[in-house]
Interface confidence: medium
């Protein structure tokens, strides 16, 4: 079986005068592509990997949405030769609804990784954007994380950073084929420089309170302190299943519909870091 | 039908400037990576730069790196080509071609542009 | 000096079969880049004849077939007709040069 190979990590890496032909080992029955899509409010980028692939032919689309960080991934095997072609994986440019004015600052700002490398990535180094509020939900978090895509014995991973919807959740994560979007959230502008090793304590959790020796003469207090070490809860689950997109659109009720690659011949590698907001 | 059309080219000095326009039509142009490519009177083709479907990702041939500039208007359909510091030997027919399946599967009909002193 | 290595020229009698070569090296062919052949009919824009090593545009008659073998391709042309004298050229993309490259071309003669 021959099959096409590329590797994209927001870059041109797929793009139509970059494609390889590879030929599979022995036992190898099938081609893979697959694309992972992440969608911040302040721009989109996109993996992929196509090659070699292993199990059986089929589909499998998911979207994904993680405190307000949506994913989109595509996976694709199919056993004919060099037919892991299909897939479109281009990040398009996300439409504002209107200008800069329709989304008005909320005061909060964080480091904004969009498929910008590890190296590019690091610390205070990034861009900042200032949060706004869309769709009826608040921006008022910032996150750090990693988006990993494996297929085809490949496996690429970049940083994410942005604005999301959750100020206090820790080392969080979706799943999709072949897909992770993990990393935690923080509370106060510029917060996400570093959240590797962020704990699950955070200030929604009553502060122990060190109560003073009691006095030999007095009966002791019978006030009670709660304390907790769990995390702040949260809905039981943070995956809400979405078939993919064709665009991204900002989120104003926008229903998400079923992919269809309106020209499948066009297959052009990954945008960059497309901003939200003219 | 597809179709692209280049415009722009004519006669210059050497070291002036040209900004070469390309209009496409029959497909949907925001989807497809666009590239310049030129060839000189009686020689072979030669990629001059390309442009990814956004216009985020670019990438220029060495001969032509810090002179040219490619750029594109989505809403327009259309490709331009900026050049300037031009010299005798960019002296070629500038066609404008779309990438397909990995390769230019539409070409324009070229504008001729002559550096000359 | 092109990237891509063509004979300068070919030719053949109508009805026969001519193949052009294309060299390549590590950095295009050899690293698994699909190669492309372009038909230039004098004085015209290039078409594309062959994409991704083998395969044809609709409209591109069956008498055109590529082949890619380790760092070199070939296009050959049954069936010889006079339409068919053009300039050919191959073309790959470049890890090294990090875009497209072609071939010099091959002027191709029908005779008779």
């Known amino acids: 079986l021959e099959c096409y190979s590329c590797v994209q990590k927001a870059d041109d890496g797929c793009s139509p005068n970059k494609m390889k032909t590879v030929k599979c080992a022995p036992g190898v029955d099938v081609c893979t592509e697959a694309v992972g899509a992440v969608e911040t409010i302040h721009g989109q980028f996109s993996l992929a990997v196509r090659g070699c692939g292993s199990g059986l032919p089929g589909k499998n689309d998911r979207g994904l949405d993680l405190h307000g960080l949506l994913a989109f991934i595509q996976l694709q095997q199919c056993a004919q030769d060099r037919c892991n072609a299909k897939l479109n994986l281009t990040s398009r440019a996300l439409d504002p609804a209107g200008n800069e004015s329709a989304y008005p600052p909320n005061g909060v700002e964080c480091y904004s990784c969009v498929g910008l490398s590890r190296e590019a990535c690091q610390g205070t180094s990034p861009p900042v954007v200032s949060c706004y509020n869309a769709s009826d939900h608040v921006y008022k978090g910032c996150f750090d994380g990693n988006v990993t895509l494996t297929a085809a014995n490949v496996t690429v991973s970049l940083p994410v950073r942005g604005c999301v919807q959750d100020e206090f959740c820790t080392r969080d994560g979706v799943t999709g084929p072949g897909f992770t979007l993990s990393g935690s959230c923080c509370q106060g502008s510029r917060c996400n420089s570093d959240l590797r090793n962020k704990t699950y304590f955070s200030p929604r959790i009553p502060p122990l309170v060190r109560l003073p020796p009691p006095e030999p003469t007095t009966v002791a207090s019978t006030t009670s302190v709660t304390t907790s070490t769990s995390a702040p809860v949260r809905p039981t689950s943070t995956t809400k299943p979405m078939p993919a997109p064709t665009s991204q659109t900002p989120r104003q009720g926008v229903e998400h519909e079923a992919s269809r690659d309106e020209e499948p011949r066009l297959t052009g590698g990954a945008a960059g870091h497309q901003d939200r907001s003219n | 039908e597809v179709q692209l059309l280049e415009s722009g080219g004519g006669l210059v000095q050497p070291g002036g400037s040209l900004r070469l326009s390309c209009a496409a039509s029959?497909?949907?142009?925001?989807?497809?990576?666009m590239s310049w490519v030129r060839q000189a009177p009686g020689k072979g083709l030669e990629w001059v730069s390309y442009?990814?479907?956004?216009?985020?990702?670019?990438y220029y041939a060495d001969s032509v790196k810090g002179r040219f500039t490619i750029s594109r208007d989505n809403s327009k359909n259309t490709l331009y080509l900026q050049m300037n510091s031009l010299r005798a030997e960019d002296t070629a027919v500038y066609y404008c071609?779309?990438?397909?399946?990995?390769?230019?599967?539409?070409w324009g009909q070229g504008t001729l542009v002559t550096v000359t002193s | 000096q092109s990237v891509l290595t063509q004979p300068p020229s070919a030719s053949g009698t109508p009805g026969q079969r001519v193949t052009i070569s294309c060299t390549g090296s590590?950095?295009?062919?050899?690293?698994?880049?699909?190669v492309h052949w372009y038909q230039q009919l004098p004085g015209t824009a290039p078409k594309l004849l062959i994409y991704?090593?083998?395969k044809r545009p609709s409209g591109v008659p069956d008498r055109f077939s590529g082949s890619k073998s380790g760092t070199s391709a070939s296009l050959a042309i049954s069936g010889l007709r006079s339409e068919d004298e053009a300039d050919y050229y191959c073309?790959?993309?470049?890890?090294?040069?990090?875009?497209?490259?072609f071939g010099g071309g091959t002027k191709l003669t029908v005779l008779g």
């Open positions: 073309a790959a993309f470049d890890d090294r040069l990090n875009g497209p490259v």
């Open positions: 442009i990814s479907s956004s216009g985020s990702t670019i």
């Open positions: 991704d090593n083998n």
């Open positions: 071609a779309r990438e397909g399946l990995w390769a230019f599967d539409y």
């Open positions: 029959g497909f949907t142009f925001s989807n497809a990576w």
């Open positions: 590590s950095s295009n062919i050899g690293a698994g880049y699909v």
